[in-house]
């Protein structure tokens, strides 16, 4: 019995000099013992003895994938021909970081492409990159286990003043983007309505320029600008913001009618539609999802629905006519 019967064209495997028919005949009881799989791998067609010419397939445990040629071939001398094959982790393990750092989102495992953000307590910043992405089985950029928090120079400079300002004698004046922002400060993704473009800016520079009355600068999110839903929403919210009656300063950001400033994180968080107060004369006529019917919503409801990424078409400002 042979898994490759000689009833057709003898086959030659890649990088194999010998044809199947050229293999010497052997006793039925000889063959190859079970091979040792790579770490985190196992033999799919497991048995005690394999015939000469028989292949075994290497599979990997969940969370790992095979890299290299995943078949071993039983040779006449009772050994296995095996290429370089290993089981590589397809997920990243939660990194071990200093206790002072907070990992968001906090999970045990992260899939390829997922990112984490490291943050520090108020008044401190990460002494290095704050955003890391799972690529293959490791984090990019690599996470140093000595990574820690350092006193935010912005906080040191500002004294009792607002962000973007510094103490000058007994009064508060705007920081100079050139003179006061030579130190490291975390990256922010910022939108400039004048140039209609977004870019990554150090927090210090953004706040200093905003203080100098550059109203065209809008905070999008913490971290460098990266394509995705967060950036998309940041841009959309900037467009909606021009009609907002509420403009509440919150950390780097400004919160609008459909948002609340989180006291613990100093970030604007979208309300959920039921949390919207009916008041306000900023109304929109919209179509929800695949519905054909029109609906009048206030700016808060529109903001919360778009923030939640629910499908909604704004037909026109003001009440629906019907």
């Amino acid at each position: 019995f042979s898994i490759m019967e000689n009833n057709g064209q003898p086959c030659i495997n890649d990088d194999e000099e010998m044809k199947e028919v050229d293999l010497p005949e052997i006793e039925a009881d000889s063959g190859c013992p079970q091979p040792v799989p790579p770490e985190n791998g196992f033999i799919r067609n497991e048995k005690q003895l394999y015939l000469v010419g028989e292949d075994v397939e290497i599979s990997c445990l969940t969370g790992f994938e095979t890299v290299g040629y995943q078949y071993f071939r039983c040779l006449p001398d009772g050994t296995w021909r095996q290429g370089d094959v290993e089981c590589q982790r397809t997920e990243c393990i939660k990194p071990v970081v200093q206790e002072v750092l907070t990992i968001t989102p906090f999970q045990r495992l992260y899939r390829i492409g997922e990112s984490i953000e490291l943050t520090c307590p108020k008044g401190f910043v990460v002494a290095g990159p704050s955003r890391y992405t799972c690529q293959g089985n490791s984090w990019t950029p690599p996470i140093s286990n000595s990574l820690t928090c350092e006193k935010d120079t912005l906080t040191k400079l500002k004294g009792h003043c607002q962000l973007g300002q510094k103490q000058s004698g007994s009064e508060c004046i705007c920081m100079s983007p050139e003179e006061d922002c030579s130190h490291h400060s975390e990256d922010l993704c910022v939108f400039d309505t004048d140039s209609n473009d977004y870019f990554t800016s150090p927090a210090c520079k953004f706040l200093a320029e905003k203080c100098l009355n550059n109203q065209q600068l809008h905070f999008l999110h913490i971290g460098s600008c990266q394509d995705g839903r967060q950036l998309e929403w940041g841009l959309e919210r900037t467009r909606l913001s021009s009609n907002s009656t509420k403009k509440e300063s919150c950390g780097y950001d400004t919160c609008y009618d459909w948002e609340k400033c989180s006291a613990s994180t100093s970030k604007c968080v979208c309300l959920l539609p039921p949390q919207c107060f009916k008041g306000g004369n900023q109304l929109y006529c919209v179509k929800m999802g695949s519905s054909t019917s029109e609906k009048t919503l206030n700016i808060c409801e529109v903001g919360t629905i778009r923030c939640a990424n629910r499908k909604m078409e704004i037909l026109h400002p003001g009440k629906c006519l019907a």
Epitope: H221, Q230, K260, S264, Q275, F277, K278, G279, N309
Partner: antibody, heavy 118, light 112 residues
Framework: EVQLVESDGGLVQPGGSLKLSCAAS????????MAWVRQGPGKGLEWVAT????????YYRESVKGRFTISRDNAKNTLYLQMNSLRAEDTATYYC???????????WGHGTLVTVSS | DVVLTQTPSTLSVTPGQPASISCRSS???????????LYWYLQKPGQSPQLLIY???DLGSGVPNRFSGSGSGTDFTLKISRVEAEDVGIYYC?????????FGQGTNLEIK
Amino acid sequence: EVQLVESDGGLVQPGGSLKLSCAASGFTFSDYYMAWVRQGPGKGLEWVATINYDGSSTYYRESVKGRFTISRDNAKNTLYLQMNSLRAEDTATYYCARPSTEALFAYWGHGTLVTVSS
Amino acid sequence: DVVLTQTPSTLSVTPGQPASISCRSSQSLLNDVGNTYLYWYLQKPGQSPQLLIYLVSDLGSGVPNRFSGSGSGTDFTLKISRVEAEDVGIYYCMQASHAPYTFGQGTNLEIK
């Protein structure tokens, strides 16, 4: 001060109907979405339904869709829950709740017990 | 539906001692714009639930600052720095990141 007072519940046979009401005071009722949340005996809490300011939009949990109807009368500052085709698993204390910018269920009524049993 | 699992189910604490309750979600509560809608409620015996913490870590109006919330993704914690007799009752976590809104099964805090 925000006050939410549910009407008395009661004992209903399986398949029967009951209408709950919730009288609201201390705030402008028509300015807020409203909701019903229930709690089975010795069980956890369960969101039931939500209604927008004027009743033009309603939302229900899957298990009560088609059987329960949430409605409101802004002139009377009253929220309602019409419950039809009642089942034993609908036995619970029903709370009416109002949101705030802090949470969806920031203010709660004292609750009313509905028992579905033969 | 998102399942929230609270541990422990019962907690017995001496007044003045700290207490910690865990709430684990069957899927991440962090949405794609970076918001997490996780709340903590306390239901005192014979009363309606009252809001303690909203948006993971913000203190509800009038809530003593011995209560604090933390966590992200799927793991959340409510901490009481020093338990007082009036803190007895059932603590519930609730999520509104995914429809329908769901609550944990509750953790009963009793005084030793």
